[in-house]
Amino acid sequence: FERTRSLQDPCSNCPAGTFCDNNRNQICSPCPPNSFSSAGGQRTCDICRQCKGVFRTRKECSSTSNAECDCTPGFHCLGAGCSMCEQDCKQGQELTKKGCKDCCFGTFNDQKRGICRPWTNCSLDGKSVLVNGTKERDVVCGPSPADLSPGASSVTPPAPAREPGHSPQ
């Protein structure tokens, strides 16, 4: 089949990094600068992506592969192939349409990207709060008070005055 195909279509012999040039009797011509072909048999070369401005070049474009970009410090990649760069926020914040905003009480974000997530509700697992949550950190759940038989652990259960998961601001 391959031999038949190449007899019928001279372009199928053009390797990656070249294109089948209709203007020159369908001979294989190298991709011009700033372009590439990642597969054989192509009739045109694709334009190389330019990693400019907020984008930085992670891998240069070659005649057979497109450039790959990442983001300048203070920004992180979003989308397939780092199609966009989104602003970093501090831990304890999330990015909104109005910019970086602190996590609401009862939520946290331990990364420079993404959204604030609710603190774990320890009581749902029958556990108690060992370490209170903050804007930057989730609560740490510990054994339930019932599991703490006298002398079985050195952990002091938290004062029961507060609702699980809450911490003073």
Partner: antibody, heavy 118, light 110 residues
């Protein structure tokens, strides 16, 4: 189809601040660079600066000390402020959408004329 | 003084082929792609050629672009009276981390 519309005062006094807004309609502001370009009467095009939708900015070094470009994604707008203006800042001001992967200005506003005069 | 250098004027008769040159340096044309814009009097510029030789939809194939080294050129074949306009080359400049323009070429159809 994405359209851009510049708005702001057509007359600014010397030493004051020129303020223009570009409203993006028919598409999202996300994923692109947004530039301000100006053209003095009878002259060529001059890039003022750009802002990426997520806030990254860069300005023409010759204007950098006087320029601020900001973006409001919730309103689909971006803005230009040029301080301490002189008669040399009299020009038609264009806002543009710039493709972020191949960098070309594929959408232009109609332009707004700003005259600096007392 | 523009970063990219274009001839201030060019002319041709209907049906002729004219070319407009654009010269730069290693930090702009030499390492990046070139775009061309067409501007009629009193109107905003319009993208004519991008990435050296690509035409946006709606642009006639009479317009073509090319690049070699630190220079680029715009060719218009089968010149028509409606092609009379100003033409600007532009491209990214790595030292500026932003775009630069040529001074523009006024094309007259005689």
């Amino acid at each position: 189809q994405v359209q851009l519309q510049e708005s702001g005062p057509g007359l600014v006094k010397p030493s004051e601040t020129l303020s223009l807004t570009c409203t993006v309609s028919g598409g999202s502001i996300s994923g692109y660079y947004w530039s301000w370009i100006r053209q003095p009467p009878g002259k060529g095009l001059e890039w003022i600066g750009y802002i990426y939708y997520s806030g990254f900015t860069n300005y023409n070094p010759s204007l950098k000390s006087r320029v601020t470009i900001s973006v409001d994604t919730s309103k689909n707008q971006f803005s230009l402020k040029l301080s301490s203006v002189t008669a040399a800042d009299t020009a038609v001001y264009y806002c543009t959408r710039d493709h972020s992967h191949y960098y070309y200005m594929d959408v232009w506003g109609q332009g707004t004329t700003v005259t600096v005069s007392s | 003084q523009s970063v990219l250098t274009q001839p201030p004027s060019a002319s041709g008769t209907p049906g002729q082929r004219v070319t407009i040159s654009c010269s730069g340096s290693s930090s702009n044309i030499g390492s990046n792609t070139v775009n061309w814009y067409q501007q009629f009097p009193g109107t905003a510029p319009k993208l004519l050629i991008y990435s050296n030789n690509q035409r946006p939809s709606g642009v006639p194939d009479r317009f073509s672009g090319s690049k070699s080294g630190t220079s680029a050129s715009l060719a218009i074949s089968g010149l028509q009276s409606e092609d009379e306009a100003d033409y600007y080359c532009a491209g990214w400049d790595d030292s500026l981390n932003g775009p630069v323009f040529g001074g523009g070429t006024k094309l007259t159809v005689l």
